[in-house]
């Protein structure tokens, strides 16, 4: 999906009002400097591409993020403020339903959410170019 035409300010507002708190809640108990920042993004569409990937694509050691509150709110924000996003996600959603639904907070998931916090932080930078 090409995130170029999203309403970035509306997504930023959704992040600041609710998604950020859910990320904080998920990370509760984690040490500040436990994980290095290794994932980056250069502009807002790129940041959303990386955020989508880390939030919804299962990775080795962390298959359970998509059912978390911050993930569901991220999905809702993208669906509302990114034209045509919902349609591209139908197949992905059906595939996800076939996976196990048990929530397990592994260290790998915490590391991944730490990277997500960094990506969202970059997305919210006031001077970050949109293209």
């Amino acid at each position: 999906y090409d995130f170029t035409n999203c309403d970035f300010e509306k997504i930023k507002a959704a992040y600041l009002s609710t998604i950020s708190k859910d990320l904080i809640t998920y990370m509760s108990g984690t040490k500040s400097t436990e994980f290095n920042n290794t994932v980056s993004c250069s502009n807002r569409p790129h940041c959303l591409t990386e955020i989508q990937s880390l939030t919804f694509n299962p990775t080795a050691g962390c298959a359970s993020l998509a059912k978390e509150m911050f993930a569901m709110k991220t999905k809702a924000a993208l669906a509302i403020w990114c034209p045509g996003y919902s349609e591209t996600q139908i197949n992905a959603t059906q595939a996800m339903k076939k996976r196990r639904k048990r929530k397990v907070t592994t260290n790998k998931c915490l590391e991944q959410v730490s990277q997500l916090q960094g990506l969202w932080r970059r997305f919210n930078r006031p001077l970050l170019k949109q293209q």
Partner: antibody, heavy 118, light 107 residues
């Protein structure tokens, strides 16, 4: 182990600028955010701003915007905080401090006293 | 910005006493609160993060609790080295803000 070593005390005249340094060691410099926090005599701790050394992006407390500039020298693993248009109420101890993506401060420099006096 | 209101500003107590310091946030900060101890001429030292997690090496007599807008730091049995100034800090929202401190003095 992580260490943050700051430059020595400074005495400045009102209207001048001061530049405080913070030399980091014991970790990969680009991995974490560097913050500056100040403490005026008998006052609260006040967060001034931060820098992401990986790309030198800065965020500042609105109270200091326009007067504070935070920079890094990657080759020296050193962060700098410059405060301009100094006034007597800027007399304070200035600390550098380190965080990851979660913004509480588990590592601090030893502090640098800046005195502004005519 | 979120305001962090700490009370009391000053507290006199004796060795062995149990003391409680409170911090109120002007809006919900979930559990994103840290507590620091500062002694004269020294940098603050992290005691508690995530409202209740003790930092490495911090004695078990220090404990934190709370969520939302009300938080407490408790020292169960004061030791001579505990007389210092204590600060709370919220890291839920940018800009990151501190309480104005509680100075704990020997009675």
């Amino acid at each position: 182990q992580v260490q943050l070593v700051q430059s020595g005390a400074e005495v400045k005249k009102p209207g001048a600028s001061v530049k405080v340094s913070c030399k980091a060691s014991g970790y990969t410099f680009t991995s974490y955010l560097m913050h500056w926090v100040r403490q005026a005599p008998g006052q609260c701790l006040e967060w001034m701003g931060e820098i992401d050394p990986s790309d030198s992006y800065t965020d500042y407390n609105q109270n200091f915007r326009g007067r504070v500039t935070i920079t890094v020298d990657m080759s020296a693993s050193t962060a700098y905080m410059e405060l301009s248009s100094l006034r007597s109420e800027d007399t304070a101890v200035y600390y550098c401090a380190l965080t990851g993506t979660i913004n509480y401060f588990d590592y601090w420099g030893q502090g640098t006293l800046v005195t502004v006096s005519s | 910005d979120i305001q962090m209101t700490q009370s009391p500003s000053f507290l006199s107590a004796s060795v062995g006493d149990r003391v409680t310091i409170t911090c109120k946030a002007s809006q919900d900060v979930v559990t994103a609160v840290a507590w620091y101890q500062q002694k004269p001429g020294k940098a603050p030292k992290l005691l508690i993060y995530w409202a209740s997690m003790r930092h490495t090496g911090v004695p078990s007599r220090f404990s934190g609790s709370g969520s939302g807008t009300e938080f407490t730091l408790t020292i169960s049995s004061l030791q001579p080295e505990d007389f210092a100034t204590y600060y709370c800090q919220q890291y839920s929202s940018f800009t990151f803000t501190f309480g104005c401190g509680t100075k704990l003095e020997i009675k």
